[in-house]
Amino acid sequence: VPGEAEQPAPELVEVEVGSTALLKCGLSQSQGNLSHVDWFSVHKEKRTLIFRVRQGQGQSEPGEYEQRLSLQDRGATLALTQVTPQDERIFLCQGKRPRSQEYRIQLRVYKAPEEPNIQVNPLGIPVNSKEPEEVATCVGRNGYPIPQVIWYKNGRPLKEEKNRVHIQSSQTVESSGLYTLQSILKAQLVKEDKDAQFYCELNYRLPSGNHMKESREVTVPVFYPTEKVWLEVEPVGMLKEGDRVEIRCLADGNPPPHFSISKGNPSTREAEEETTNDNGVLVLEPARKEHSGRYECQAWNLDTMISLLSEPQELLVNYVSDVRVSPAAPERQEGSSLTLTCEAESSQDLEFQWLREETDQVLERGPVLQLHDLKREAGGGYRCVASVPSIPGLNRTQLVKLAIFGPPWMAFKERKVWVKENMVLNLSCEASGHPRPTISWNVNGTASEGDQDPQRVLSTLNVLVTPELLETGVECTASNDLGKNTSILFLELVNLTTLTPDSNTTTGLSTSTASPHTRANSTSTERKLPEPESRG
């Protein structure tokens, strides 16, 4: 065609897939009458008539564009709807009079790809691989034109590097004409890459300019041999008997090797393998002083059968031995003196304390407790506590009972008990002394006796309330080799109608179930009167 070499560059129209392209015929009035124009599409240098304009009226030609073309802007602009990637071609308008001129438009089509989908090698990468391994793939679906991919490691772009980094990209054309890009990152990784963050970036163009989309960041499982093995003990710090102690073997390799933990036997000077759980952890629960010793860990690479040994670790399970008190069962006369001595062994320095059992009052700080001018009240329990101040909770105790020789000593001298006639009454009487007293009652009934402690006894009596009993009351007598003593229980009939809640003559009614005919299940629990009682 004469003069084709001087053809001006076509006008560029850029549009996104799915939108409408406005193709404006740029012929000047001198070049042609816009009321009489033919529109062509050019594909592979073949032009096809797609639209005619006659007297300002448009008419589509049959074919692929038939349903998508319309005239706008008083016939100067051809609108192409629902643009697809296949529409990326040259369109030209040709005026008919006064002489045939044409105006060319290059339509460029764009579509942003979907978010890149990154997949990591699910099996991981060994650092000793002979060739670069597939680290991850990046897929950008449905973009146009083909987006560019850039791989990043720790925020820095990765470049091709012979025998180290290789990026393999390929694309497929979907039936829609859009491209799906797949990029495979192959690399030889090193141990330091175990924490590296990889991601891919898709760079693409739209009519509005250049854009990019990033994938999520991923880490890649990296496998590397163990170089170092060590032991860790939990809890950290001073250990004591009774603690739950975990001895854990650790290694700097991935995957972790197979572990075994052994303890040195001081007598044989040989290491004995300990039984660990499935995770290779030795659990001592409860820890005992016998667990103290020298531990070490052996790690095995099951592929190479090479083993590594940890530095040995000394484990000390602190303890306090059984506490011994002498004399173990002291007996003393009133007015005499007593020295109590406490002994124990420990892996640490010990502190001793003497406490009164009944009150928890601290009597002495130290292993020796001296008691002078002993009174009857001094009888009872004394507790020695041996503790390690530097290890909270590490202590042992021993209780010793001091017996003071003396005649029986009554818990009360006399007591009033509210009763109803014909009820079965449950009476109790308590006495202490050394030697331990026995208790007898002055009325018939069912009596039972129980030791409260070596010097104290409690007797209970079940008896039917009769008029005679109401008159005489009940006596209990405690006796031992050194004498006897008596307590009196006065029985008073209760009058439910006259007994008021604010009565200050008594502490109230004993709980009882009164039944004139049935003695079973009829009990009464007496309460002490509020006035002070004489003892002894």
Partner: antibody, heavy 116, light 106 residues
């Protein structure tokens, strides 16, 4: 086109060692990894072992001590050996191609029966 | 290890029905999921990869969706030739398969 074909004994005695070979065509073992997958009769699929395009080997930890996977790139073959076979190892054994991380092509499978 | 749980274990539907099979991962596997079809006595055949990408040559009535832990395989219009057992498989960390879903025609 891409094909994978398993071969090996159909009957193995308990405690014996099984050796299976996967011969591939239509692709190179240096371009794609290969996995072994098995399926006991009437049961689900179970991944056993893999060898990557770079030659790295991977094993299912449930069998690790019994397995060895290797390849001969010149013969386009991947070999799996499984020691100490037991009747519970009776299954159809498949080899499958990685693309690059999922399995896009499978062999036709070989049924291995473990019985005395 | 990541466990994959398929439901239902079996189903029966009529020709033309829309069928959905579910697969749940014991942890987040993003989109590292494939679906396979295994006809009786045949080899597993890849249908879907990367959770929603249709393998070349597979009819468009098959589609996959989901991400993270919950995934679905949908057969938009069940055909007689779709009678098979369907397996999901994760490839996020190692390889594990679901227990399978047997699809039959009513």
């Amino acid at each position: 086109q891409v094909t994978l074909k398993e071969s090996g004994p159909v009957l193995v005695k308990p405690t014996e060692t099984l050796t299976l070979t996967c011969t591939v065509s239509g692709f190179s073992l240096t371009s794609n990894g290969v996995s072994w997958v098995r399926q006991p009769p009437g049961k689900a699929l179970e991944w056993i072992a893999a060898i990557s395009s770079g030659g790295s080997t991977y094993y299912n930890s449930a069998f690790k001590s019994r397995l060895t996977i290797s390849r001969d790139t010149s013969k386009s073959q991947v070999v799996l050996t499984m020691t100490n076979m037991d009747p519970v190892d009776t299954a159809t054994y498949y080899c499958a191609r990685h693309r690059p991380f999922y399995f896009d092509y499978w062999g036709q499978g070989t049924l291995v029966t473990v019985s005395s | 290890d990541i466990q994959m749980t398929q439901s239902p274990s079996s189903l029966s539907a009529s020709v033309g029905d829309r069928v959905t099979i579910n697969c749940k991962g014991s942890q987040n596997i993003y989109k590292s999921l494939a679906w396979f079809q295994q006809k009786p006595g045949k080899v597993p055949k890849l249908l879907i990869y990367d959770a929603n990408s249709l393998q070349t040559g597979i009819p468009s009535r098959f589609s996959g969706s989901g991400s993270g832990t919950d995934f679905t395989l949908t057969i938009s219009s069940l055909q007689p030739e779709d009678v098979a057992t369907y397996y999901c498989q994760q490839y996020y960390s190692g390889y594990t398969f679901g227990g399978g879903t047997k699809v039959e025609i009513k």
